[in-house]
Amino acid sequence: MAVTACQGLGFVVSLIGIAGIIAATCMDQWSTQDLYNNPVTAVFNYQGLWRSCVRESSGFTECRGYFTLLGLPAMLQAVRALMIVGIVLGAIGLLVSIFALKCIRIGSMEDSAKANMTLTSGIMFIVSGLCAIAGVSVFANMLVTNFWMSTANMYTGMGGMVQTVQTRYTFGAALFVGWVAGGLTLIGGVMMCIACRGLAPEETNYKAVSYHASGHSVAYKPGGFKASTGFGSNTKNKKIYDGGARTEDEVQSYPSKHDYV
């Protein structure tokens, strides 16, 4: 039961996280015009990974795409790449994890295969989350650097009568969405990996039984592996992929209220 819950929750958390990563990648508010300590403008600027926008007091919003690849900063390209890699890995991870879910029966798929798929999807979610967090962090670092550079420029070269106020940009909503989403995907991935340990067939148990049968003085009790395998004391040592056999996790296979988030 605990394994099913952990796996299901990991899937749902990862799903929310990946949806968040996609949302963050598409959002226009990666950086927004800094309003603090600046003259109040009737025009508000904000920028995303794909286009920059201007919202006027009139309510009119104009967005312009970055219709160039070579002219864009390398850092922006790197952030785009990280976010896309994160989305792709996350999407593949979701696809794999759907088939790996214990509550879904697909033919006569063995639990060992499900365990491998759960681990694979878990790793994919972890890498996906890390990609998103890295991408957002790189962009945030770029913003901080540019912010202080433009702040320095604001207070230099003002000897004349005419002042040019440089637009400074600060963290936009997409950064926070990206950090949270990346974190959720990472957590979901970790949960899937934990669930995998509980799904894996306990090969050590077979070895323990054969050892015992050979008459050695030292007998290995399968129950001793409880902590490391995630199994309960399954002294009967049934093959968990047998049709009629059930582990303690499978005793109640009907959905309970805890199976849904």
Partner: antibody, heavy 118, light 113 residues
């Protein structure tokens, strides 16, 4: 056709209050801001501030904070300018204007002359 | 506040001649986000409300004759009437449409010589 129709001229005594109306037609009232502009006799244009009919949010120029209040009645697509504690120097023509994209004032009311005299 | 300085205060031009009005702002009105200059020009005839001529420094409002044109960027702007007509006699105002308060210039009175 977009139209802004303002209320008629007002003659008031110092210390009194006046409420100027600006009725909009020909467009969705809540979609565009209403600005107020003052023009004293023989003088230039002074931007007083604006009100967002969608949110009700107001922005005032520093010299028009306090005695000047912008308000709305969206049910009748009308914006109002209320001036309290009138002074002789408030004598002017008050215009309302629609804020359109490009932050431009594309349509203006005909103006309301407010005369403050004892 | 942004100070908008118009020059000259008044201008007398012969019919059919070119009239040029200058406007200078104390800070740049160029928005880096869309590379537009938030400067607007209005025409006001006696006893009438102002009429919009040019926005974004150089974009002519629909219905405005093409003899009116706007130019400039940053802090220096110009309104040009290529061939002055009798109906162009009015006061012309530039306005900062970028910073609050949305200040107007002092106005330039255009007359026929």
């Amino acid at each position: 056709e977009v139209q802004l129709v303002q209320s008629g001229s007002e003659l008031k005594k110092p210390g009194a209050s006046v409420k100027v109306s600006c009725k909009a037609s020909g467009y969705t009232f809540t979609n565009y801001g209403i600005n107020w502009v003052r023009q004293a006799p023989g003088q230039g244009l002074e931007w007083m501030g604006w009100i967002n009919p969608y949110t009700g949010e107001t922005t005032y120029a520093e010299e028009f904070k306090g005695r000047f209040v912008f308000s709305l009645d969206t049910s009748v697509s009308t914006a109002y300018l209320q001036i309290s504690s009138l002074k002789a120097e408030d004598t002017a023509v008050y215009f309302c204007a629609r804020l359109y994209y490009g932050n431009r004032f594309d349509s203006w009311g005909q103006g309301t002359l407010v005369t403050v005299s004892s | 506040d942004i100070v908008m300085t118009q020059s000259p205060d008044s201008l007398a031009v012969s019919l059919g001649e070119r009239a040029t009005i200058n406007c200078k702002s104390s800070q740049s009105l160029l928005n880096s986000g869309n590379q537009r200059n938030y400067l607007t020009w209005y025409q006001q005839k006696p006893g009438q409300p102002p009429k919009l001529l040019i926005y974004w420094a150089s974009t002519r409002e629909s219905g405005v004759p093409d003899r009116f044109s706007g130019s400039g960027s940053g802090t220096d702007f110009t309104l040009t009437i290529s061939s002055l007509q009798a109906e162009d006699v009015a006061v012309y105002y530039c306005q900062n449409a970028y910073y609050y308060p949305l200040t107007f210039g002092g106005g330039t009175k255009v007359e026929i010589k």
